[in-house]
């Protein structure tokens, strides 16, 4: 492995317990995917974790172990962006309805849209139960954080050339060694309190000028806004 | 049709090197792990190591460590297995096998993994 | 290193029976655990991966189910083509990968 510090995520570290209250867990049986908790009773994830039936998992930070924060609510409404390409991954996005209102409290909330796209060099918190692997596979029980920069577009375009489309970015180290990875998609990418990413793709995890790559929220505000209002 | 296609049965003497080709075709050879795994007669299945054929890093299982080798030809499509310093224990079947999780653009969500697809194997037998 | 336990190393059974094989994680896997399918002389053949889904092509007599550190494979009516050798693996934690040691489904 190129690199063999005591990964997580990969390359960085617990989350402080439920210090990532919007964050949730995906769950099929078994957790699949992240997601953000935008309102008491909607999530976004990433188009590519659709699946017909889902639990959607709030105040979770062992998930193997109950501790008495979760929130258990199934989906009552799936919904993929309709232009979602599952070849390219563009519009890699999704919203979910619960069948019932979260209860918001100090471990369970909801975090913001976007007012603005991504800065270059904004520092981000990207989260989730992915592998902390970056060869082979270690997946965690407790939640995984990672700081990462925004990365500027040329640099994104040109580590991956004619798969960046305006509705992604990168954000990550071209060093390697710090990214997110399988298990970590449909999760947050939060910069400046705003939810500005979802956990998307990447060629491997945390390898050298392969950073990941992230849906661009920003450009799905008035979306998720339209989709919610008509499914109300 | 995706397959794994292994070289022939090699007979060695102890001390010896035997390098097992494993030629892949149906599929993105470079966007999927390569495993190999070993048979001893009448035993159960033994992990040997991996090889990320875009990348060629590779994982090795702590008891092959230092014997073994593992290495792709992307021109070919073709995965190698070299074990070096051969005893008589390490007569067995030695298998390729494909994990279908994609290496290259891949969705970060939570693969499941397995082996899809194996090599028809290859007999190795060391004996002096 | 994960150790993968399976009971019981033989299992006789008549055809058309049931049959009910267990894999045991030392351990937890998550949903991270497949199923083989080994007749002699043969490469090993994808039964079930993420515990609990059928490869392509695999006869809807053959169920995975479980998670965690406890698994099982059932096969609901045993034809004669299904007496062979069955192999669970963990892809939770590796290198290394691991397999349990296999149990064997033979004709009562």
């Known amino acids: 492995a190129p690199f063999d510090d005591d990964d997580k995520i990969v390359g960085g570290y617990n989350c402080e317990e439920n210090s990532v209250p919007y964050q949730v867990s995906l769950n099929s049986g078994y957790h699949f995917c992240g997601g953000s908790l935008i309102n008491e009773q909607w999530v976004v994830s990433a188009g590519h974790c659709y699946k017909s039936r889902i639990q959607v998992r709030l105040g979770e930070h062992n998930i193997e172990v109950l501790e008495g924060n979760e929130q258990f609510i199934n989906a009552a409404k799936i919904i993929r962006h309709p232009q979602y390409d599952r070849k390219t991954l563009n519009n890699d996005i999704m919203l979910i309805k619960l069948s019932s209102r979260a209860v918001i409290n100090a471990r369970v909330s909801t975090i913001s849209l976007p007012t603005a796209p991504p800065a270059t060099g904004t520092k981000c918190l990207i989260s989730g139960w992915g592998n902390t692997a970056s060869s082979g596979a270690d997946y965690p029980d407790e939640l995984q954080c990672l700081d990462a920069p925004v990365l500027s577009q040329a640099k994104c375009e040109a580590s991956y050339p004619g798969k960046i489309t305006s509705n992604m970015f990168c954000v990550g180290f071209l060093e390697g060694g710090k990214d997110s990875c399988q298990g970590d998609s449909g999760g947050p990418v939060v910069c400046n309190g705003q939810l500005q990413g979802v956990v998307s793709w990447g060629d491997g995890c945390a390898q050298k000028n392969k950073p990941g790559v992230y849906t661009k929220v920003y450009n799905y505000v008035k979306w998720i806004k339209n989709t919610i209002a008509a499914n109300s | 049709q995706v397959q794994l296609v292994q070289s022939g049965a090699e007979v060695k003497k102890p001390g010896a090197s035997v390098k097992v080709s494993c030629k892949a075709s149906g599929y993105t050879f470079t966007g999927y792990y390569m495993h190999w795994v070993r048979q001893a007669p009448g035993q159960g299945l033994e992990w040997m190591g991996s090889i990320n054929p875009s990348s060629g890093g590779t994982n090795y299982a702590q008891k092959f460590q230092g014997r073994v080798t593992m290495t792709r030809d992307t021109s070919i499509s073709t995965a190698y297995m070299e074990l070096s310093r051969l005893r008589s224990d390490d007569t067995a079947v030695y298998y390729c096998?494909?994990?279908?999780?994609?290496?290259?653009?891949?969705?970060?969500?939570?693969?499941?993994?397995?082996?899809?697809?194996w090599g028809q194997g290859t007999t190795v037998t060391v004996s002096s | 290193e994960i150790v993968m336990t399976q009971s019981p190393a033989t299992l006789s059974v008549s055809p058309g029976e049931r049959a009910t094989l267990s894999c045991r994680a030392s351990?937890?896997?998550?949903?991270?655990l497949a199923w083989y399918q080994q007749k002699p002389g043969q490469a090993p053949r994808l039964l079930i991966y993420?515990?609990?889904t059928r490869a392509t092509g695999i006869p809807a007599r053959f169920s995975g189910s479980g998670s965690g550190t406890e698994f099982t494979l059932t096969i609901s009516s045993l034809q004669s083509e299904d007496f062979a050798v069955y192999y669970c693996?963990?892809?939770?934690?590796?290198?290394?990968?691991?397999f349990g040691g296999g149990t064997k489904v033979e004709i009562k």
């Open positions: 993420g515990a609990s």
């Open positions: 096998a494909r994990d279908p999780v994609l290496l290259l653009r891949q969705q970060r969500i939570l693969h499941e993994s397995a082996f899809d697809i």
């Open positions: 351990q937890s896997v998550g949903s991270n």
């Open positions: 693996q963990q892809f939770h934690n590796w290198p290394p990968l691991t």
